[in-house]
Interface confidence: medium
Amino acid sequence: LSCHFPRRPAYGDVTVTSLHPGGSARFHCATGYQLKGARHLTCLNATQPFWDSKEPVCIAACGGVIRNATTGRIVSPGFPGNYSNNLTCHWLLEAPEGQRLHLHFEKVSLAEDDDRLIIRNGDNVEAPPVYDSYEVEYLPIEGLLSSGKHFFVELSTDSSGAAAGMALRYEAFQQGHCYEPFVKYGNFSSSTPTYPVGTTVEFSCDPGYTLEQGSIIIECVDPHDPQWNETEPACRAVCSGEITDSAGVVLSPNWPEPYGRGQDCIWGVHVEEDKRIMLDIRVLRIGPGDVLTFYDGDDLTARVLGQYSGPRSHFKLFTSMADVTIQFQSDPGTSVLGYQQGFVIHFFEVPRNDTCPELPEIPNGWKSPSQPELVHGTVVTYQCYPGYQVVGSSVLMCQWDLTWSEDLPSCQRVTSCHDPGDVEHSRRLISSPKFPVGATVQYICDQGFVLMGSSILTCHDRQAGSPKWSDRAPKCLLEQLKPCHGLSAPENGARSPEKQLHPAGATIHFSCAPGYVLKGQASIKCVPGHPSHWSDPPPICRAASLDGFYNSRSLDVAKAPAASSTLDAAH
């Protein structure tokens, strides 16, 4: 018996250690969203095990203060759905000391009435505006730069109408550096991670998107006022195209934004001559007056594989040839204006009818097939470059029905260190739970144990490879105290045990020869410490009769003092 798998929050994620009693589920939200509810649930034992709390949700907060803002995102409440009426949201962004901020407009969609977005160059509602949706018809594609370390963002909505609102991306950057670039639906690689002058950045688009406007490669120029020499490009899902890759994606125009009305788009997909194509239609949400047609060949006269209108759930089509033509015609009269309305089609080259479709390479990783032919039983393993980790299943198997057992994985940048683990006989103080770059873990040994190694570990970024701890986890070893040095037996007496070194905590016993009496402690102890030392001075043996006493006194005077009167263990 176990707990049900907890629901993944929209705009967030959940990681589960176990679904059995005692197991836990941890929730976190995507950038720009905040967790509402318990961050951590525990599976409780019962006839039917259950979670100790309701699953939390990720909500876009109406305003907030973001101190030490490095990179992130602020989104309007409800995003990417519509915001509600009568909102007044204020966000204050504050960059780390000595840094400035750059804002990218990821999306701004306000109802055409009295809804308003103002961005101010300062830390309060009186600061001068650098963007006001009332004043500006178009978004500045190059974004906004703060003159100091603050931006103040105001969103106000009235009592009528609503829209998707806004998503803004912020990046802090140092003096003498450019800000971190951003391309929606794409990616970039940079020659240096902090973007000083001279850095070049190369952009690429996600599958299905095409680079438009701007430049593929930009450079950080001008040491006096560092800036990018060109605007960042945009990645857009375009209407029509010719594709000759062995695998890829075809998206409805403008995806995931709504497609326009009255469009007639044609895509041609061409693979190697003797191959065929598997079309995996993952999303199909079009209007009843819109038509998506697949032709089994390289023009519109070919046999129709399928023609679809309206919404439809996930399905697959197979061509009989090496070409497929996809035509999309949207109704000129009505438009479906919702977010993620349209279609997402993945295609794969299929060698012949006895093999699984060819699998593509993945960005920042590579694949290793267990055998060259992708016949039933073939296993393809995906691995990522150092500094990236596999998201999804790294092992895909060609099944009986000649489909792959799992979806294609991806390689995601590792932005945190692994948990360095607990150290026996210690407790630890953690600066942040997921060990992001800059996080520290401090180990404090229990009493009676001493630390061997570094007590504080810091998670450092590396240009090549995953972030790494500054040191190994230390050890807490049982305190090994120095022993006490042996004391000489008193004259006319004896000691036991007769050792040169006595461990901390040990006791020695003294006794006198017949006719002598002990003056001082009969037992003394080696007291643990740094250094360890004897609890008392050593005793002496005195003659029992007066004659003997005087004889011994004269001898005492004639003798040098016993060296054993030095009590510490260092000598």
Epitope: T244, Q371, V375
Partner: antibody, heavy 117, light 107 residues
Framework: QVHLPQSRPELVKPGASVKISCKAS????????IHWVKQRPGQGLEWIGY????????TYNQKFKGKASLTADNPSSTAYMHLSSLTSEDSAIYFC??????????WGAGTTVTVSS | DILLTQSPAILSVSPGEGVSFSCRAS??????IHWYQQRTNGSPRLLIK???ESISGIPSRFSGSGSGTDFTLRINSLESEDIADYYC?????????FGAGTKLELK
Amino acid sequence: QVHLPQSRPELVKPGASVKISCKASGYGFTRSYIHWVKQRPGQGLEWIGYISSGSGGTTYNQKFKGKASLTADNPSSTAYMHLSSLTSEDSAIYFCARGGVRYFDVWGAGTTVTVSS
Amino acid sequence: DILLTQSPAILSVSPGEGVSFSCRASQSIGTSIHWYQQRTNGSPRLLIKYASESISGIPSRFSGSGSGTDFTLRINSLESEDIADYYCQQSNSWPLTFGAGTKLELK
């Protein structure tokens, strides 16, 4: 037209290493695989391994692991094979060939490597 | 490793004749066999893939057949430019392996 010009012949001493190149043109270099094949004088063909130009992923014939190392430089559309600890057994013509994972549709002219003291 | 045995090692034929090359695999490999031609001092050239699939630009006199363990390459009317070594190659499992080749010479 697809071309795979290869680097010039190499005369090297036993124990040394050599790096031979294969520059691709006329097609999308990052969307294919470059294989390397060995042919000893008067003998047959032996597959060494391939590199996926796009990802840098490699698959080797176990026999050549530790002997051959395959790399690719996408900006220059060039594939390389580094051969180490050379002996007379490594004297051969080394071909690069473009293909899918399974067969080779275009071949380079070959690079002759002679190992001699 | 899969062993490919080509026979005969040498074939002597006259122009205009038909000729067949044999390639036998040490285990069943479906149709995962590909044929190459290598002229003297030249590079190999792909003739046939997957046992019987033709390659654009290769004369139609070249054809292939077979599946499982036995495969055949045929030239239906030999021309002098066909004098070369012929190799089969399997792609059923790693490592990819070639046969030792058959040398075609003029009678």
